[in-house]
Amino acid sequence: NFMYSKTVKRLSKLREYQQYHPSLTCVMEGKDIEDWSCCPTPWTSFQSSCYFISTGMQSWTKSQKNCSVMGADLVVINTREEQDFIIQNLKRNSSYFLGLSDPGGRRHWQWVDQTPYNENVTFWHSGEPNNLDERCAIINFRSSEEWGWNDIHCHVPQKSICKMKKIYI
């Protein structure tokens, strides 16, 4: 009876995600057969989050909208380890929007999920950010410094990275 009700709960939870994520990839968390963590297929997973590289070229606003219709946000990078994981899936000749912007052009950077902007955990290329008209952040590759962040005009279409919490069933 317990297993049956657990299965029913799982199925109803899966149905919630079906519209945008018809397929989920799930792994067993720990030793308990009851706990599964899932990411939409073909998203990648790292710690408690799922990541998707969007290869369509869109402005920052539309990139965020694209993530949101999938139940995600543009990526918020919290640690060096997280960035190191993300860059494994990026192409060196492309740039990708992050969930970081400076809407007022006053160098008050803010993350889309309201995570406090911590100057000590940022990975700007040297000399960046450098322009008050460039109010959105991208991650890109520079041969001299490898991967880092750059400010760019928000309307210039770029690829993007979406991030969502893992789905626990």
Epitope: M57, K62, N131, D133, E134
Partner: antibody, heavy 118, light 107 residues
Framework: QVQLVQSGAEVKKPGASVKVSCKAS????????IHWVRQAPGQGLEWMGT????????SYNQKFKGRVTMTRDTSTSTVYMELSSLRSEDTAVYYC???????????WGQGTLVTVSS | DIQMTQSPSSLSASVGDRVTITCRAS??????LAWYQQKPGKAPKLLLY???TLADGVPSRFSGSGSGTDYTLTISSLQPEDFATYYC?????????FGGGTKVEIK
Amino acid sequence: QVQLVQSGAEVKKPGASVKVSCKASGYTFTSYIIHWVRQAPGQGLEWMGTIYPGGGDTSYNQKFKGRVTMTRDTSTSTVYMELSSLRSEDTAVYYCARMGDNEYFDYWGQGTLVTVSS
Amino acid sequence: DIQMTQSPSSLSASVGDRVTITCRASGNIHNYLAWYQQKPGKAPKLLLYDAETLADGVPSRFSGSGSGTDYTLTISSLQPEDFATYYCQHFWSTPYTFGGGTKVEIK
């Protein structure tokens, strides 16, 4: 007032290149991105790509990639669109357009007719 | 790439008529749609954006509606200066494609 003034008509031979200019005035040049759109005679409109005058970042329609180059000169508030390896199908009016804060084309140049003929 | 299919390609109407033009996208464009008016030898002029927001200086007889993949431009009472060609354009992702155009002619 905002104005985008384009260079004059051009006649080119197949295989040649053309460089069309678009001079902006009446606003801060580096604050708005510029797009290029073309229209063949009696036909519809086709988006070619965009350039950000501040940093020079570009994004091109894959259809034109390798043939189109967009550049800018901030000292003269001018953007340029160069199309190479011209063919007769490239005969068209080429427009520059400014993307406004609302992310739509709010101001357009008057157009530049490029004729490709042997 | 998202394709934009506009219909009809042309129509004949009289002054005072109500005119409706439709635009269908091959994918969801989330209301990121503009409508333009173009007269012979002139550049297009922005009429509406975000599917239904009137651009500055555009008369209120022009209106837009729609969502997802299907959008409509309506001219409630056609005026002599409205005879022109109308285009839709999406701004969801590049390339920002246009519809094929609708030529509105005098009946």
